[in-house]
Amino acid sequence: IWELKKDVYVVELDWYPDAPGEMVVLTCDTPEEDGITWTLDQSSEVLGSGKTLTIQVKEFGDAGQYTCHKGGEVLSHSLLLLHKKEDGIWSTDILKDQKEPKNKTFLRCEAKNYSGRFTCWWLTTISTDLTFSVKSSRGSSDPQGVTCGAATLSAERVRGDNKEYEYSVECQEDSACPAAEESLPIEVMVDAVHKLKYENYTSSFFIRDIIKPDPPKNLQLKPLKNSRQVEVSWEYPDTWSTPHSYFSLTFCVQVQGKSKREKKDRVFTDKTSATVICRKNASISVRAQDRYYSSSWSEWASVPCS
Amino acid sequence: RNLPVATPDPGMFPCLHHSQNLLRAVSNMLQKARQTLEFYPCTSEEIDHEDITKDKTSTVEACLPLELTKNESCLNSRETSFITNGSCLASRKTSFMMALCLSSIYEDLKMYQVEFKTMNAKLLMDPKRQIFLDQNMLAVIDELMQALNFNSETVPQKSSLEEPDFYKTKIKLCILLHAFRIRAVTIDRVMSYLNAS
C-alpha cells in the first residue's frame, strides 16, 4: 500500500481467482483513543472499533472511503483504491491502446518545435467518475523539472456504438534550450482513477523524436505564362523554432484530386516555393518536416487549384 | 559564445555540402547497424545515450545562433580553448567566435574518427564478420575535417591488447552511431546557419 495523495491510498493486488489479497491497517488521524468506530462509504454498518482498523482487501467491494467517527462526528477519511496486477502485468483497463506507433501505446505526445513545450493525449471510452493527474521530468535518476497543466477533455468522437473521449495535457520543460542535444529522455507519468480503480501509464521520449511542425502558412499560387505549371509559395509556420536557417524545414508539395486514388504530382523541396502542374478540381497541398532529423511530417496546408 | 551575424558570403561555404554528406552517411550507417544488429539493443529506446565529446568540446554552446544567446538555458557554457584557423572560414569576415565553433566541430570529428577506426579494427577480428563501418562514412568524416582544415595534434589510435568482447563492441558501436548522428544534425544546422547568414 502506498499514498497517492493526502488520505488516498493505493493497494496493489495480484488479481487471480481466490487470491489472498492484502492485509491493510488503517489508522484514524486523531488524538482521540477511545470510542472510535469505522464505516465504509455511505453505509452505516460499523466495520470495527478502535484507533486502527485491519482489513483484508481482495476485491473492489473492499475498496472505497473508510471513515472513522466518534459520537457522530467524522474524525478522518482514508480512500482505498485498487491497482490490479494480472499475470505480472499491471491492468490497463481505463485507457485505450492507440496502437500507434506500436502496440501498447496509451499516451501519445507531440511537440510543434524545440522550445521544450509538448502536448500529450490519450483516449478512453469512460465518461464519468474519471480523474487524471500528470507528472513529468527530464530523466528519472536525477530528474530535471517539467511543469504540466491539468488534463482536460479535448475531444469527443463517436466510434461505432461507442463514444470515445480524448484527454490532453500541455507540459513545458522548465529550462529548455532549443539547440541542446538531448541525452536524457522526458518521462511522462499519468495517474488514472476510475471509481475505485487506479492505473498508471508512462511514456518516455526525446523532444526531437516527437517533433511535428504545424502546417506551412500563407500558401499562394502564381500561374506561369504559357504553361500548365503554377508556382506555389508558402512560409514557415509561426510556431516553428527560430532562426529558420538553423532550424530548417523541408517540404513536400503535392497536387491531388479529392480521392487518394487519383493521379498526382509530387515534389520535395528545401525552398519555400515550387513549380507544379495544377489540374482542374485538384488541390495543392504542402507539408513540412525537420530538414535534418526526420520525425513526423506536419498536417497538409491546402489551396484549390482553380 | 555564439555565432555572429557577419559570416561568409552565401555559396562561399564549402563545409555545408560536406556536412550534408556526413549526416547522410551516419544516418545510413545507423540504419544498417539497426538492421544487421536486430537482436542487439541498438534502437534509440534501448541504448544509453553517451556523448564521447562531453567536457572535451562544447560545440552546441560555441556554435549557438545569435538569436538563442538571449536564452539563459542555452548559456551554461563550458570553457574550452581551441585553435583558430581554418579554410571553411571566409578569411577576413571570420570572427573569433566562429573560429571557436568550427574548431570545436573539428575536434568532435577527430574524436569520433579515432573511436570509429579503433572499433572497426576490433570488428574486423570478429569471426562472425557481422558488421563493419561503412568506408564512405569514414571518408566523409575525413573530407569535412579537411575542409575545416584546422591544425591540431593527432590523436593516436587506441590499441588494445586484450581479446575484444564483440558483443560489447557492437553495442558500443550503436551508442556511438546514435550520438554521432545527433552531433551530425547539430553540425548540419550550424553549417546551414552560417551559409545563410
Partner: antibody, heavy 118, light 107 residues
C-alpha cells in the same frame, strides 16, 4: 496487371511522319499520366513529354517541342506519339511509360524501334 | 535544364560484391531522384523512388540514398540477374532528365 503494349517496329524515309501507339490495360486509362521516352542506339534515356488522358493536357521537353505530338484516345485506352520531319538522328527505340505520379515512370511499354533511313 | 552525371560509366564486379553507383545533379534537387535498371533489349524498370524509397517487388539488396546534389544506388550483394545498366532520373523540374547510365558488367 497493369500493362502497356506498343505497336511494332517502323522503317521510314527522312522527312516522313510516323505515329506509334501504346495500348494500356489492367487499369483505368485516364487514372495514369502517359509519357514518352526516347533511347537512341547505345545511348541513354531522354524524356520527351507527357499527356493527361483525362483532359488531353500535354507538356513537352523543349528539345522535342514542334517535333512531336502526343495524343490519347480514351475510347480505346491508347496513347500515341507522332514524330514529324524525320531525320536519321530520330532512329531510336521509343518507350511509352505510365504512372499515377507525374514525374517518374512506374510501368513501361516494351519499346518501338523507329528506323529512319533513305 | 538540370544535368545529371553518373559515375562510373561502367563497373566490373563479381557475384556477391557490393556495388555503389553515384549520380550528381547540376543543382540541388532535394530528394527528387529515381533509379531504374535496364537490361539489353528490355524496357527500364523502376528500382527506387525519391532517392531512398523502396518499390514493392524490388529485392531489398537495392538501396538508395542522398539528397541535394549527391545520390547513390547500392547493390548489396550482386546477383547474376543484376548485371545491367542503371539510370538515375531527376523529377525536381521539367524537363525531366536522366543520367548517362552506369553499366554493371561481369568481372
Amino acid at each position: 496487371e497493369v500493362q502497356l503494349v506498343q505497336s511494332g517496329a517502323e522503317v521510314k524515309k527522312p522527312g516522313a511522319t510516323v505515329k506509334i501507339s501504346c495500348k494500356a490495360s489492367g487499369y483505368t486509362f485516364s487514372d495514369y499520366y502517359l509519357h514518352w521516352v526516347r533511347q537512341r542506339p547505345e545511348k541513354g534515356l531522354e524524356w520527351m513529354g507527357w499527356i493527361d488522358p483525362e483532359n488531353g493536357d500535354t507538356e513537352y521537353a523543349p528539345k522535342f517541342q514542334g517535333k512531336v505530338t502526343i495524343t490519347a484516345d480514351t475510347s480505346t485506352d491508347t496513347g500515341y506519339l507522332e514524330l514529324s520531319s524525320l531525320r536519321s538522328e530520330d532512329t531510336a527505340v521509343y518507350y511509352c511509360a505510365a504512372n499515377k505520379e507525374l514525374r517518374y515512370f512506374d510501368v513501361w511499354g516494351q519499346g518501338t524501334l523507329v528506323t529512319v533511313s533513305s | 535544364d538540370i544535368q545529371m552525371t553518373q559515375s562510373p560509366s561502367s563497373v566490373s564486379a563479381s557475384v556477391g560484391d557490393r556495388v555503389t553507383i553515384t549520380c550528381r545533379a547540376s543543382q540541388s534537387i532535394s530528394i527528387n531522384l529515381h533509379w531504374y535498371q535496364q537490361k539489353p533489349g528490355k524496357a527500364p524498370k523502376l528500382l527506387i523512388k525519391f532517392a531512398s524509397q523502396s518499390i514493392s517487388g524490388v529485392p531489398s539488396r537495392f538501396s538508395g540514398s542522398g539528397s541535394g546534389t549527391d545520390f547513390s544506388l547500392t547493390i548489396n550483394s550482386l546477383q547474376p540477374e543484376d548485371f545491367a545498366t542503371y539510370y538515375c532520373q531527376q523529377s525536381n523540374s521539367f524537363p525531366l532528365t536522366f543520367g548517362g547510365g552506369t553499366k554493371v558488367e561481369i568481372k
